[in-house]
């Protein structure tokens, strides 16, 4: 844990936007917050008939849904868009749908990159 | 929390002006703090943040080189150095605590005007 | 980062349901406050991280969204909401305020 709001947690960076946005593609994001917030990685994603459509990765300001989560796990039954956060260096690495209704987890490995930092 | 910004005043368009920021009620040395104006009628505008060691510093574009902000921990306050002043920068400036401006400042008037 | 918001200018009554949006150029996560201005005074934070009620703001005022799209939401406007609103994205530099929402009296 740092000093003051420049505690740093790092994320794993993903727009699927990326050219209309004009940003990065992907890579690493440096998280920066205020002293008495916390901070999180998160994850969204789209699941058209069971292929899996990333459209964004990175930082997640204080929120409390978000506390003492090790591992990124969307909850909603069945959303247009998945969500999930959580707390820890790259913690969003790797995400999972496990609906709080029950139904089969699902969990996501990502393929294999080289990623580049943004700060 | 509080933040009393001083050093605003009327002067002419190419001139400097020293706005000052002192804050009490927390610890001063644990935070960024920020710099923040509104035109008259105007909507409000960032103008610049330090960080709580003085070791970044960023600004809107339009002062870029022109305004400078910097902080004396041991005496809680920021400062805004402000040269070559132009009509635009006519408005009030606020100090702001933190960079997500949780508490504000009451504000200081600067004027420029031949 | 480009903010814009949605009205610029509205007239409600007191009792009434208010929403305003502002949406950002790109995608800011949830790297978004919301201010409130009357006339005169200073402006107050209500809402930081998008959705987080600032310390001793009333439970009327929420705020939702994420990405691009944000609203500050008023659920029973009271006569000391009249104002004008303001968003600020603070994900990249230079930070910028939506244009701001003058909330009148109908």
């Known amino acids: 844990s740092g000093r003051g709001e420049a505690e740093t947690r790092e994320c794993i960076y993903y727009n699927a936007n990326w050219e209309l946005e004009r940003t990065n593609q992907s890579g690493l994001e440096r998280c920066e917050g205020e002293q008495d917030k916390r901070l999180h990685c998160y994850a969204s994603w789209r699941n058209s008939s069971g292929t899996i459509e990333l459209v964004k990765k990175g930082c997640w300001l204080d929120d409390f849904n978000c506390y003492d989560r090790q591992e990124c796990v969307a909850t909603e039954e069945n959303p247009q868009v998945y969500f999930c956060c959580c707390e820890g260096n790259f913690c969003n690495e790797r995400f999972t749908h496990l609906p709080e209704a029950g139904g089969p987890e699902v969990t996501y490995e990502p393929p294999p990159t080289a990623p580049t930092l943004l700060t | 929390v509080q933040l009393v910004e001083s050093g605003g005043g009327l002067v002419q368009p190419g001139r400097s002006l020293r706005l000052s920021c002192a804050a009490s009620g927390f610890t001063f040395d644990s935070y960024w703090m920020s710099w923040v104006r509104q035109a008259p009628g105007k909507g409000l505008e960032w103008v610049a943040n330090?960080?709580?060691?003085?070791?970044?510093?960023h600004y809107m574009d339009s002062v870029k080189g022109r305004f400078t902000i910097s902080r004396d921990n041991a005496k809680n306050s920021v400062y805004l150095q402000m040269n070559s002043l132009r009509a635009e920068d006519t408005a009030v400036y606020y100090c702001a605590k933190g960079a997500w401006l949780d508490y504000w400042g009451q504000g200081t008037q600067v004027t420029v005007s031949s | 980062i480009q903010m814009t918001q949605s009205p610029s200018a509205m007239s409600a009554s007191v009792g009434d349901r208010v929403t305003i949006t502002c949406r950002a150029s790109?995608?800011?996560?949830?790297?978004l406050a919301w201010f409130q201005q009357k006339p005169g005074k200073v402006p107050k934070r209500l809402i930081y991280?998008?959705?987080s009620l600032q310390s001793g703001v009333p439970s009327r005022f929420s705020g939702s969204g994420s990405g691009t799209g944000f609203t500050l939401t008023i659920t029973s406007l009271q006569p000391e909401d009249f104002a004008t609103y303001y968003c600020?994205?603070?994900?990249?530099?230079?930070?910028?305020f939506g244009q701001g929402t003058k909330l009148e009296i109908k």
């Open positions: 790109q995608g800011i996560s949830n790297y």
């Open positions: 991280a998008a959705s």
């Open positions: 600020l994205q603070h994900k990249s530099y230079p930070y910028t």
């Open positions: 330090i960080k709580y060691d003085g070791s970044e510093k």
